[in-house]
Interface confidence: low
């Protein structure tokens, strides 16, 4: 049965979804267990010109010390104002000094990166040590690079399309996800549904997606259901500022009781099917409908509260 609900983009003042993901357009993770230098390469595309970027390097300490030096190769296509955090990491940074400006002195060894095409940059980096990870990111706002985390099965890194960087790299796109909404025809009342659909990633290991939900309305004003649909290997950790009905695939828990896993359901994996679930749950408004790549953290900010839906 077709559910009549014409999904249209919702104005940003009604709902915004940001997310952190390990999915990259191109990437690779390799193991270089005996290398004295751990090499990471980032190709960053900024389509709208000069940008700000927060780049954090995090070391997984072994016996209290970071055992290897790290070379980070930063290749950018336009001007970047960089906030770098790499506390206590013996870091060498290779970058184009005419394009990258630091928010504060980096306090690390720096090397000028030659103006090479991508393939040659990888070769240049590989001459300095085996590449542990490489990734191509489009318009990142922030990047977290975890050192010593590489668990790839590859012995060398070769860029491949649509890769999951696992725990090695997480990033947040600058552009929020497209949020759509609609009215469910023939359903009375003011119950609203927030639907988040997380698409399958390239690797299918167990994942927890943290979902932060912030709805700006008085607690008594809200009658809402949060529908979370994802691949079977995804479980959910929900951090919500309102009580609402929860309807998920896999298992979920709440941030206040993270140890208590609650079993979810097998939900449809199509937009139409999920709208049908919302209808079955007596929602009259789909206040937000979002489809995302496999993410680690998703933040939903909405101000609908069972009120009138405004689409842009």
């Amino acid at each position: 049965e077709t559910v009549h609900c014409d999904l249209q983009p919702v104005g940003p003042e009604r709902g915004e979804v940001t997310y952190t993901t390990s999915q990259v357009s191109k990437g690779c993770v390799a193991q270089a267990p005996n290398a004295i230098l751990e090499v990471h390469v980032l190709f960053l595309e900024f389509p709208t010109g000069p940008s700000q970027l927060e780049l954090t390097l995090q070391a997984s300490k072994q016996n209290g010390t970071w055992p290897r030096e790290v070379l980070l190769v930063l290749s950018v296509n336009s001007s970047v104002f960089l906030h770098l955090q790499a506390l206590g990491i013996p870091l060498h940074l290779a970058y184009n000094s005419s394009l990258v400006t630091f928010q504060e002195p980096p306090g690390v060894n720096t090397t000028e990166l030659p103006s090479f095409p991508k393939t040659q940059i990888l070769e240049w980096a590989a001459e300095r040590g085996p590449i542990t990870s490489a990734a191509e990111l489009n318009d990142p706002q922030s990047i977290l690079l975890r050192l010593g985390q590489a668990q790839g099965s590859l012995s060398f890194c070769m860029l491949e399309a649509s890769q999951d960087m696992g725990r090695t790299l997480e990033w947040r796109p600058r552009t929020p996800a497209l949020v759509r909404g609609c009215h469910l025809e023939g359903v009375a009342g003011h119950k609203e549904a927030h639907i988040l659909r997380v698409l399958p990633g390239h690797s299918a290991g167990p994942r927890t997606v943290t979902v932060k939900v912030e709805l700006s309305c008085a607690p008594g004003d809200l009658d809402a259901v949060l529908i979370l649909q994802g691949p079977p290997y995804v479980s959910w950790l929900i951090d919500a500022n309102h009580n609402m009905q929860i309807w998920t695939t896999g298992e979920y828990s709440f941030k206040i009781f993270p140890e208590k896993n609650i079993r979810g359901f097998k939900l449809p994996d199509t937009p139409q099917g999920l709208l049908g679930e919302a209808r079955m749950l007596n929602a009259s408004i789909v206040a937000s409908f979002v489809e995302l790549p496999l993410a680690s953290i998703v933040s939903l900010h909405a101000s609908s509260c069972g009120g009138r839906l405004q689409t842009s």
Epitope: A204, G205, P206, P232, Y233, I246, K260, R263
Partner: antibody
């Protein structure tokens, strides 16, 4: 149409072993979370074990009463669920149902009777 | 483990009667599922997620409740409704069933 057909039940002595099978059809078996539920004569339902799909790394779960004695497994190429029961006790006497968990146990087999008696 | 206590354990009623079966959990659960079983047959899914009727279940059945108290109601008992009804939760490990409520003909 979803069909679950159990087999392998029978009479066995305490301490003995038995292997139950459940042949599945009418749905994508490899995507399904599959369970065994049992019912002792004249008693209520008791969950025994679950095995999840390949996408969930075929994770397995057991009731305390059978942990260490029973092993759940599956062969997705044969659309078949198994329950290997070792060190059987008289209290394991029951009808064993193969079930599919979706939002709840939405499909059940007809059951196979296991009798543990000397 | 979460214990589910069904009451009454059995009841006698006439066709047309309104029947209510209770399921109380020893601690709060998110959802309750209900199954119907007739003698010598496998259980059938009846109500899922507390209030949703499984496929083919007549609308005279309804489910309600939250927290620790859940109810299955038959608004007007029909001859085919005489059976045993079980509640079940899996909000917390392990999955548990209630002891069952047998609905008999008066």
């Amino acid at each position: 149409e979803v069909q679950l057909v159990e087999s392998g039940g029978g009479l066995v002595k305490p301490g003995g072993s038995l292997r139950l099978s459940c042949a599945a059809s009418g749905f994508t078996f490899s995507d399904a979370w599959m369970d065994w539920v049992r019912q002792a004569p004249g008693k209520g339902l008791e969950w025994v074990s679950e095995i999840r799909s390949k996408a969930s790394n075929h994770a397995t779960y057991y009731a305390e009463s059978v942990k260490g004695r029973f092993t759940i497994s599956r062969d997705d190429s044969k659309n078949t669920l198994y329950l290997q029961m070792n060190s059987l006790k008289t209290e394991d006497t029951a009808v064993y149902y193969c079930t599919r968990w979706r939002r709840f146990f939405d499909s059940w087999g007809q059951g196979t009777l296991v009798t543990v008696s000397s | 483990d979460i214990q589910l206590t069904q009451s009454p354990s059995s009841l006698s009623a006439s066709v047309g009667d309104r029947v209510t079966i209770s399921c109380r959990a020893s601690s709060s659960v998110s959802y309750m599922h209900w199954y119907q079983q007739k003698p010598g047959k496998a259980p059938k899914p009846w109500i899922y997620a507390s209030s949703n009727l499984a496929s083919g279940v007549p609308s005279r059945f309804s489910g309600s409740g939250s927290g620790t108290d859940y109810t299955l109601t038959i608004s007007s008992l029909q001859p085919e409704d005489f059976a045993t009804y079980y509640c079940q939760q899996w909000s917390s490990n392990p999955l548990t069933f209630g002891g069952g409520t047998k609905v008999e003909i008066k």
